[in-house]
């Protein structure tokens, strides 16, 4: 598979790696989300490991307010991180793969 | 980097690999999008290589109607593909990484 197809596969499999631990196996509860972030996105989390920060993040992701993060909400979250990465990327034109 | 962080990096770098070819270097025009899909997402595209299909896809992705796909629109697109992959994944519970 091409790198982008592999990337999408990783997005899906990572979600299910954690959503399958407790409760609804197709949703991330707070503890599952916390474990996913800690293990799979340590660069994003940084030092923000306090409870209030997790609660806020969970609340921001949980658009249907069911106290869980479903796959669509997770995709929105990853897109937000990707957009932050992209802003950084665009801020350093010398790092661009190609010039126009 | 962890697999999910690498996946996000691939999402960003793949976009810029093609957006940097013509015109606005932070957006994909129709030919850049076509090349990205053909080379990086062949499984998604399948046999759908006719012009009308590309025009329709381009129109669906181009939410701000500027005839180009910016990074946010590209993220929405990838999220949609990921959600399709996820529906397939959830349809085969024996493929789940964990049971509850």
């Amino acid at each position: 598979a091409c790198p982008l197809e592999k990337a999408l596969d990783v997005m899906v499999s990572t979600f299910h790696k954690y959503s399958g631990k407790e409760g609804d196996k197709f949703k991330l509860n707070k503890s599952e989300l916390k474990e996913l972030l800690t293990r799979e996105l340590p660069s994003f989390l940084g030092k923000r490991t306090d409870e209030a920060a997790f609660q806020k993040l969970m609340s921001n992701l949980d658009s249907n307010r069911d106290n869980e993060v479903d796959f669509q909400e997770y995709c929105v979250f990853l897109s937000c991180i990707a957009m932050m990465c992209n802003e950084f990327f665009e801020g350093f034109p010398d790092k661009q793969p190609r010039k126009k | 980097a962890c697999p999910l962080e690498k996946a996000l990096d691939v999402m960003v770098s793949t976009f810029h690999k093609y957006s940097g070819k013509e015109g606005d270097k932070f957006k994909l025009n129709k030919s850049e999008l076509k090349e990205l899909l053909t080379r990086e997402l062949p499984s998604f595209l399948g046999k759908r290589t006719d012009e009308a299909a590309f025009q329709k896809l381009m129109s669906n992705l181009d939410s701000n109607r500027d005839n180009e796909v910016d990074f946010q629109e590209y993220c929405v697109f990838l999220s949609c593909i990921a959600m399709m992959c996820n529906e397939f994944f959830e349809g085969f519970p024996d493929k789940q990484p964990r049971k509850k």
Partner: antibody, heavy 120, light 107 residues
Framework: QVQLQESGPGLVKPSQTLSLTCTVS?????????WNWIRQFPGKKLEWIGH???????NYNPSLKNRLSMSRDTSKNQFSLKLSSVTAADTAVYYC?????????????WGQGTLVTVSS | DIQMTQSPSSLSASVGDRVTITCRAS??????LNWYQQKPGKAPKLLLY???RLHSGVPSRFSGSGSGTDYTLTISSLQPEDFATYYC?????????FGGGTKVEIK
């Protein structure tokens, strides 16, 4: 200390639109909270109307969805409610509340409430 | 919608009494249960959230317990300022729904 203050007409004619605004002070419209409308009927029953929150995300009570509209003005620290085609059954005390980000999303701050009577 | 049923609808008690109010949900609400106190002419005030967590400034004589569909609010030693109406509310899913209330009156 967070304070919420409802404002709007206390009397609305049947079939007209009820419009209320809530002004938030002591806290800005951060993305960490959802801002709700709840009403209490004369018999003291409480009903959740809807809320507006992160990224402008809005959820309405399905029983009112067809008549309901909510919006916010972050520059004024205000959010508002419009309920159309009102009847006497919409007579209630209307509260605006803040929904915390903690488990179960409790309503941790409430306005003092404003009585809206629907009558000709 | 999830239906919330409170019992009793009213009760009479004396200062110092231990008071228990129950709340039953029509389906499992996974501990996402909040309790409020309301006094006449005032807005409700949050007491407990997520079944048993005390909101800031709430006295420790208030406690909550339960799981699944059945939940309880307990006031260990009723004080004069506790005579009020108490409401449960589920925070498990939308739309949010409330119990009908329990009025605690002076015996």
């Amino acid at each position: 200390q967070v304070q919420l203050q409802e404002s709007g007409p206390g009397l609305v004619k049947p079939s007209q639109t009820l419009s209320l605004t809530c002004t938030v002070s002591g806290d800005s419209f951060t993305n960490d909270y959802y801002w709700n409308w709840i009403r209490q009927f004369p018999g003291k029953k409480l009903e959740w109307i809807g809320h507006i929150g992160y990224g402008g995300n809005i959820n309405y009570n399905p029983s009112l969805k067809n008549r309901l509209s909510m919006s916010r003005d972050t520059s004024k620290n205000q959010f508002s409610l419009k309920l159309s085609s009102v009847t006497a059954a919409d007579t209630a005390v209307y509260y605006c509340t803040r929904e915390s980000f903690y488990d179960g999303y409790p309503f941790d701050y409430w306005g003092q409430g404003t009585l809206v009577t629907v009558s000709s | 919608d999830i239906q919330m049923t409170q019992s009793p609808s009213s009760l009479s008690a004396s200062v110092g009494d231990r008071v228990t109010i129950t709340c039953r949900a029509s389906q499992d609400i996974r501990n996402y249960l909040n309790w409020y106190q309301q006094k006449p002419g005032k807005a409700p005030k949050l007491l407990l959230y997520y079944t048993s967590r005390l909101h800031s400034g709430v006295p420790s004589r208030f406690s909550g317990s339960g799981s699944g569909t059945d939940y309880t609010l307990t006031i260990s030693s009723l004080q004069p300022e506790d005579f009020a109406t108490y409401y449960c509310q589920q925070g498990n899913s939308l739309p949010r729904t409330f119990g009908g209330g329990t009025k605690v009156e002076i015996k």
